[in-house]
């Protein structure tokens, strides 16, 4: 972690393993204004690579729902709505940080916890790898 | 929140706020084993909507380091290297926690903080208006 | 459970053009692909083209200016039309659903076929 | 197109027997999202395939344990542990990593 001078406004800690454990207020600051993915945009249809929108759900999580994007086609959709086998459709993935509880049903303590989850689809060029 | 029962082998909150503020333990289980975005994969150059990936750090901020993508072009990458403005290269975004020091500087006390970033690019077809 | 069934003709005359019908039960025509697939007497298994959930379409390339698929997803049919019919396109014709929900992306339930002879 | 080619044509065996088929393709099987999609069917006399192996090694439901597959890249193997008189018919590997293709078959018959 970065090293950062102590503040004497700074609530105190008395855990013993200080920094791992820190104290997290849940009143989430939102910067943005964004919705449920799956209004927000329509990249997911009007994408070459479109893809559908699964929901993932874990009481044991913070946030407790996340969509999953899974593309719907290997290839990728040409002008004329026929999907095109030279090109591929791939899932962009992000790591994300969600809060699980631990110990598990605990309402005010966590764990950070990192997971991948792929957020939409792009069209990519294959590498193509012939037998010689 | 979720109402989940009280478990009696549960660290005990002494906030007045509670559930509002809760520990957190900041020793990451990663359930995934994905490096930086720029190794993971070169996606990012081999897609008909390519995009660049810009570091943006704040060190009141966990994780200090996010990569942001924007895309390259505003039309989408042709198999013949050009780029075709029939069709739109856009930003897959994202909301993501983050940890925001609060107050600034303190090393052990965190607001959970949504953010919006752009993840990759895709190709979509545009939406046309035409005059009437 | 998932059916697929195959309905055709039976016999079409050389240059005259098959529509075969496959009536789906037990699943949605917008969550999953059906493909069409031949198979000539005594030969091997010929895939002909996908019409996928969001309804585009994948062909097989060189049969792709003969071929035409289309679908109604109120009625729960597929069907699939075939020009310029010679002797060698004598063969069972099966549609079968593509497990597209659950991304294998293969066919995992197929009709029982349909023959198709082409002959005058 | 990506050509799949079988070996053998055909596979006589005794009952209780281990059988193995080969698969090769043309081209890697590699998608470029790291999947690899090869897929086996067996379709028995007067009958329509069915599908046995998705995504190289995964057992479609129902498919008996003694069913196995392997392999990667351009090369792949079905094996049978120990042949049962229902598993007679014709095997036919798939791929869809590129538009679909299918093996020529491999017709597993009693010795």
């Known amino acids: 972690g970065i090293a950062i001078p102590r503040n004497s406004g700074c609530p105190n800690s008395e855990d013993k393993n200080f920094p791992r454990t820190v104290m997290v207020n849940l009143n989430i600051h939102n910067r943005n204004t964004s919705t449920n993915p799956k209004r927000s945009s329509d990249y997911y249809n009007r994408s070459t690579s479109p893809w559908n929108l699964h929901r993932n759900e874990d009481p044991e999580r913070y946030p407790s729902v996340i969509w999953e994007a899974k593309c719907r086609h290997l290839g990728c959709v040409k002008a004329d709505g026929n999907v095109d086998y030279h090109m591929n459709s791939v899932p962009i993935q992000q790591e994300i940080l969600v809060l699980r509880r631990e110990p598990r049903h605990c309402p005010n303590s966590f764990r950070l916890e990192k997971i991948l989850v792929s957020v939409g689809c792009t069209c990519v060029t294959p590498i193509v790898h012939h037998v010689a | 929140g979720i109402a989940i029962p009280r478990n009696s082998g549960c660290p005990n909150s002494e906030d007045k706020n509670f559930p509002r503020t809760v520990m957190v333990n900041l020793n990451i289980h990663n359930r995934n084993t994905s490096t930086n975005p720029k190794r993971s994969s070169d996606y990012y150059n081999r897609s008909t909507s390519p995009w660049n990936l810009h570091r943006n750090e704040d060190p009141e901020r966990y994780p200090s380091v996010i990569w942001e993508a924007k895309c390259r072009h505003l039309g989408c990458v042709k198999a013949d290297g050009n780029v075709d403005y029939h069709m739109n290269s856009v930003p897959i975004q994202q909301e993501i926690l983050v940890l925001r020091r609060e107050p600034r500087h303190c090393p052990n006390s965190f607001r959970l903080e949504k953010i919006l970033v752009s993840v990759g690019c895709t190709c979509v077809t545009p939406i046309v208006h035409h005059v009437a | 459970q998932v059916q697929l069934k195959e309905s055709g003709p039976g016999l079409v005359a050389p240059s005259q053009s098959l529509s075969i019908t496959c009536t789906i039960s037990?699943?949605?025509?917008?969550?999953?692909?059906v493909h069409w697939v031949r198979q000539p007497p005594g030969k091997g298994l010929e895939w002909l083209v996908v019409?996928?959930?969001?309804?585009?379409?994948t062909y097989n390339s060189a049969l792709k200016s003969r071929l035409s698929i289309t679908r109604d997803n109120s009625k729960s049919q597929v069907f699939l039309k075939m020009n310029s019919l010679q002797t060698d396109d004598t063969a069972i014709y099966y549609c079968?659903?593509?497990?597209?929900?659950?991304?294998?992306?293969?066919?995992?339930?197929w009709g029982q076929g349909t023959p198709v002879t082409v002959s005058s | 197109d990506v050509v799949m080619t079988q070996t053998p044509l055909s596979l006589p065996v005794s009952l209780g027997d281990q059988a193995s088929i080969s698969c090769r393709s043309s081209?890697?099987?590699?998608?470029?999202?790291?999947?690899?999609?090869l897929h086996w069917y067996l379709q028995k006399p007067g009958q329509s395939p069915k599908l046995l192996i998705y995504k190289v090694s995964n057992r479609f439901s129902g498919v008996p344990d003694r069913f196995s597959g392997s392999g990667s890249g351009t090369d792949f193997t079905l094996k049978i542990s120990r042949v049962e008189a229902e598993d007679l018919g014709v095997y036919f590997c798939s791929q869809s990593t590129h538009v679909y293709t299918f093996g020529g078959g491999t017709k597993l018959e009693i010795k």
């Open positions: 019409i996928w959930s969001d309804g585009t379409t």
């Open positions: 037990g699943f949605s025509l917008t969550s999953y692909g």
């Open positions: 079968a659903r593509d497990s597209t929900w659950d991304y294998y992306y293969t066919m995992d339930y």
């Open positions: 081209q890697s099987l590699v998608h470029s999202n790291g999947n690899t999609y």
